[in-house]
């Protein structure tokens, strides 16, 4: 039953003398395993003996053994899935048809594929995208319908007979759809490769040449042009005649229109390949080309520089840069239209003419005001010499010069009064717009420059003002020399460094920061009596009674300044020391007396001693001795010590009298 | 097989002349540009000058510039590069080479030819 | 002229490791018309790279081109023992045409 053979092989195998064939085959035989395999050349079936005749190239028996005459001849495969053969080497007469006796325990087939046996190497076949532009990539490919493994083979591209620089693609198929190689050369053809051959050579393992194919390329571009001029160097002077002429070097498909363009632009009405230009002007200068079209776009010539000379025309001044801020650098160029270029020029500045400056620009590294103004040039070439233009301006542009700031107001000026100054300058480019003060206070300026200080402070030394227009200049600062009484006074103890103490020699010095006029007078006051009139108040010994507050008084022509209160401490030992007695220095028995101990001392006592009439110390250290009751025993003398930090002091001694009471006299 | 064939090399004095050779075979010699290459003995590589397929335009070194011609004969499929003046740094390895755009890599060299200039 | 200036002068590496070869130019090449070519000692140099990165017919795929502008560098993946030779690189964007100084690649 034929419907149970499945095969699949290419259907004709291509090889040549001495080559090989690799036949990749499969199939399938549904009742079971390959029992036994013959293959045969050119096949016929014998209806006599029901068998098939022919050469037999390879037979497999059941034992699986090969017979060593069929080596050349391989059966790859195996007894279920796989047919594939190997013939190595293939010969001519080895073309026709093969058939596979395939036998299955019930089944048989034969199955027949074609072998081409070529005498020598065929060709290659080359295929070329239909069409090919300049500078477009294209694949060019070239197909062998011939693969074996146990030969091998490289296809090689060549260009006019050099191998082709661009790395080529090499693929093999050896599968049950198709055997071939094919070799993939990517290249992007330019117009020069146009009508070039292109070869795809068959070589052997060892590059030894087998066959080719060639083509010739069809590269479609632009059409290619030259231009010619005469003159050749294309310069000519006014008046005279030009002949320009395009050749096409190259051009596929042929070209359709001519044109010629100048600086870009279409010339009309010119529309063959000579360009005749008769008594040029100078407008005719220009860069020339001719284009020619095919279908597959416009192609231009290199371009012509076509130089009509002519003596230069009006001069024209360009600065760089005008405004020019004084200091900068400043280039003038001289513009002439002219061919050839001027070789000498000429600068005027106001009218005259500038010495030494012969050049097409003139550099001036360190730009002044009086450089300021119009500048003008004439420029000469080898056909004359040309007329002095307009001119062009330089404004030269610097900060405010020579600022001052000046006092309006009569001198001298005093604290608080309302002082008025003005900034002024002596020349400006462009004008002042406004103008800043230094130090900045709450003045006002009442109009533009002038700045009014209401109520001076004594401190107002110096103001400076600027003068600005884009930029500022500062004038020197001026001295506001404002006058006012002397300030912060006081009074200073230079002597003793330490406290003060009676007998001691003082010196107290009146001292203030400032006073503007400077000579000044000094008064010393004590309790409203004047004292002296000295910057120092001197002491030889201080007393007591030196103690109290002190005020010193300074003034100069504008007005006079009192310190405040000083108080003068002097310290002492207690002094006019008595003891006083309560109720009276003769008190009855039985009743209260108390003794004080009375004095005078800086500081005040801090310790106090008393003393009876036999100079014997009592214990008792308050400032008040009390006795109660006191006894008659108690009549006697007292005295009382007192100290202080500075010393000691007594006094002289105060007798208590007690007398009995009429109780004890009705006693007795 | 693609082939490039240097001769006309040898000794020469300074100020003398030399004419080099470079014979092609195996491609369509009139399709290609040709250059002439040299290497100093230890040196890179330098470029001397080149010649269009058609022959028409002509590159030369400044180094060799009105000292040096470069020309070709279709015909006979050869280059050549006529040597006048010549310098003891002239001393090199001359290489030609082919190559299909005047401007280019170049894709296959001669084996080379020795020029000595001395005294 | 565009002056071509390769480095390092010499490369010391092992046989198996990456090169990295560099050659930078004066001013950019137009197109990126740029060559490298390989010189075996007594023998005339062999295109290897042109446009830069485009590898030449028959050339391994171990050598690889890269760069544009001014800076470009040949990179071979692992060296052979064959590879340990000169290196040249060449502009064509400009005539005068030009060579680098070259790179000699050496078995460390």
């Known amino acids: 039953d034929s419907s149970k053979w499945v095969f699949e092989h290419p259907e004709t195998l291509y090889a040549w003398e001495g080559a090989c064939v690799w036949i990749p085959c499969t199939y399938r035989a549904l009742d079971g395993d390959l029992e036994s395999f013959i293959l045969f050349h050119n096949p016929e079936y014998n209806k006599n003996t029901s068998k098939f005749d022919g050469t037999r190239l390879y037979e497999s028996t059941k034992d699986g053994k090969v017979p060593s005459e069929q080596k050349r001849v391989q059966f790859l495969g195996d007894k279920n899935k796989n047919c594939t053969l190997s013939i190595h080497p293939v010969h001519l007469n080895d073309s026709g048809q093969l058939g596979l006796r395939m036998e299955s325990k019930t089944e048989k087939w034969m199955e027949r594929i074609h072998l081409n046996v070529s005498e020598r190497p065929f060709p290659p076949h080359i295929q070329l995208p239909p069409e090919i532009q300049e500078s477009q990539e294209v694949t060019l490919t070239c197909l062998l319908n011939f693969s074996c493994y146990g030969y091998p083979i490289q296809l090689q591209w060549l260009l006019e007979g050099v191998p082709m620089r661009q790395a080529a693609v090499t693929s093999t198929s050896l599968t049950i759809k198709s055997v071939f190689t094919r070799s993939e050369l990517k290249f992007s053809p330019q117009w020069s490769h146009h009508g070039k051959i292109v070869t795809c050579q068959l070589q052997d393992a060892d590059g030894k040449f087998l066959s080719n194919d060639t083509v010739q390329l069809n590269v479609k571009h632009t059409p290619k042009l030259e231009i010619k001029v005469t003159p050749s160097d294309a310069i000519v002077r006014e008046g005279d005649s030009v002949t320009m002429t395009c050749e096409v070097s190259s051009s596929n498909p042929e070209y359709t229109t001519v044109s010629w363009l100048k600086d870009g632009t279409s010339l009309k009405k010119q529309n063959t390949f000579t360009l005749n230009l008769r008594e040029v002007t100078k407008d005719q200068s220009g860069k020339y080309c001719c284009q020619v079209s095919n279908d597959v776009g416009p192609g231009r010539s290199e371009e012509v520089f076509l130089q009509v000379q002519y003596a230069p025309e009006p001069s024209t001044v360009q600065i760089l840069h005008s405004p020019a801020v004084e200091g900068s650098q400043v280039e003038f160029l001289c513009m002439s239209l002219a061919n050839p270029l001027p070789t000498n020029y000429t600068w005027y500045h106001n009218g005259k003419e500038m010495q030494g400056r012969t050049e097409e620009k003139v550099h001036i590294p360190k730009i002044l005001p009086w450089h300021a103004g119009t500048y003008s040039c004439v420029a000469e070439n080898i056909l004359g010499t040309g007329q002095r233009g307009p001119g062009a301006e330089l404004d030269v542009q610097y900060p405010p010069k020579k600022v001052t700031t000046v006092i309006q107001n009569p001198m001298p000026i005093r604290e608080g009064d309302t002082v008025t100054l003005s900034c002024n300058y002596n020349s400006s480019n462009p004008s002042v717009t406004r103008y800043e003060w230094k130090p900045h206070g709450a003045w006002e300026e009442p109009s533009l420059g002038v700045l009014k200080i209401q109520n001076v402070g004594w401190d107002n030394t110096t103001i400076a003002c600027a003068a600005c227009n884009s930029w500022c200049s500062w004038a020197s600062p001026v001295a506001l020399n404002v006058q006012y009484a002397p300030r912060d006074v006081r009074v200073r103890k230079i002597k003793p460094l330490s406290e003060i103490h009676s007998g001691n020699s003082v010196s107290l010095q009146c001292d203030f920061s400032s006073s503007h006029p400077k000579e000044v007078q000094f008064f010393w006051e004590k309790n409203g009596r004047l004292l002296g009139k000295e910057s120092q108040l001197n002491f030889d010994s201080i007393s007591p009674e030196d103690a109290g507050s002190y005020s010193c008084w300074v003034n100069n022509s504008i007005g006079q300044t009192a310190s405040k209160a000083w108080t003068l401490e002097v310290l002492y030992a207690p002094r006019r020391l008595r003891v006083s007695m309560s109720p009276g220095d003769q008190v009855m028995e039985g009743k209260s007396a108390t003794l004080t101990c009375e004095s005078d001392a800086n500081p005040p006592v801090s310790h106090y001693t008393w003393f009876d009439w036999n100079n014997q110390s009592l214990p008792y250290h308050s400032q008040k001795l009390r006795l109660e009751p006191v006894k008659v025993q108690h009549s006697g003398a007292y005295w009382c010590q007192g100290t202080n930090s500075v010393g000691k002091g007594r006094s002289p001694l105060s007798t208590l009298t007690v007398y009995y009471s009429p109780e004890t006299i009705g006693r007795r | 097989e693609v082939q490039l064939l240097e001769s006309g090399g040898g000794l020469v004095q300074p100020g003398g002349s030399l004419r080099l050779s470079c014979a092609a075979s195996g491609f369509t010699f009139s399709s290609y540009a040709m250059t002439w290459v040299r290497q100093a003995p230890g040196k890179g590589l330098e470029w001397v000058s080149t010649?269009?397929?058609?022959?028409?335009?002509?590159y030369s070194a400044d180094s060799v510039k009105g000292r040096f011609t470069i020309s070709r004969d279709n015909s006979k499929n050869t280059l050549y590069l006529q040597m006048n003046s010549l310098r003891a740094e002239d001393t090199a390895v001359y290489y030609c080479?082919?190559?299909?755009?005047?401007?280019?890599?170049?894709?296959?060299w001669g084996q080379g030819t020795m020029v000595t200039v001395s005294s | 002229e565009i002056v071509l200036t390769q480095s390092p002068g010499t490369l010391s590496l092992s046989p198996g490791e990456r090169a990295t070869l560099s050659c930078r130019a004066s001013?950019?090449?137009?197109?990126?018309?740029l060559a490298w070519y390989q010189q075996k000692p007594g023998q005339a140099p062999r295109l290897l790279i042109y446009?830069?990165?485009s590898r030449a017919s028959g050339i391994s795929d171990r050598f690889s081109g890269s760069g544009s502008g001014t800076d470009f560098t040949l990179t071979i993946s692992r060296l052979e023992p064959e590879d340990f030779v000169v290196y040249y690189c060449q502009q064509y964007g400009s005539s005068p045409l030009t060579f680098g100084g070259g790179t000699k690649v050496e078995v460390k």
């Open positions: 010649i269009s397929g058609s022959g028409v335009s002509t």
């Open positions: 446009g830069a990165s």
């Open positions: 080479a082919l190559h299909w755009e005047l401007l280019d890599a170049f894709d296959i």
């Open positions: 001013q950019s090449i137009s197109y990126n018309y």
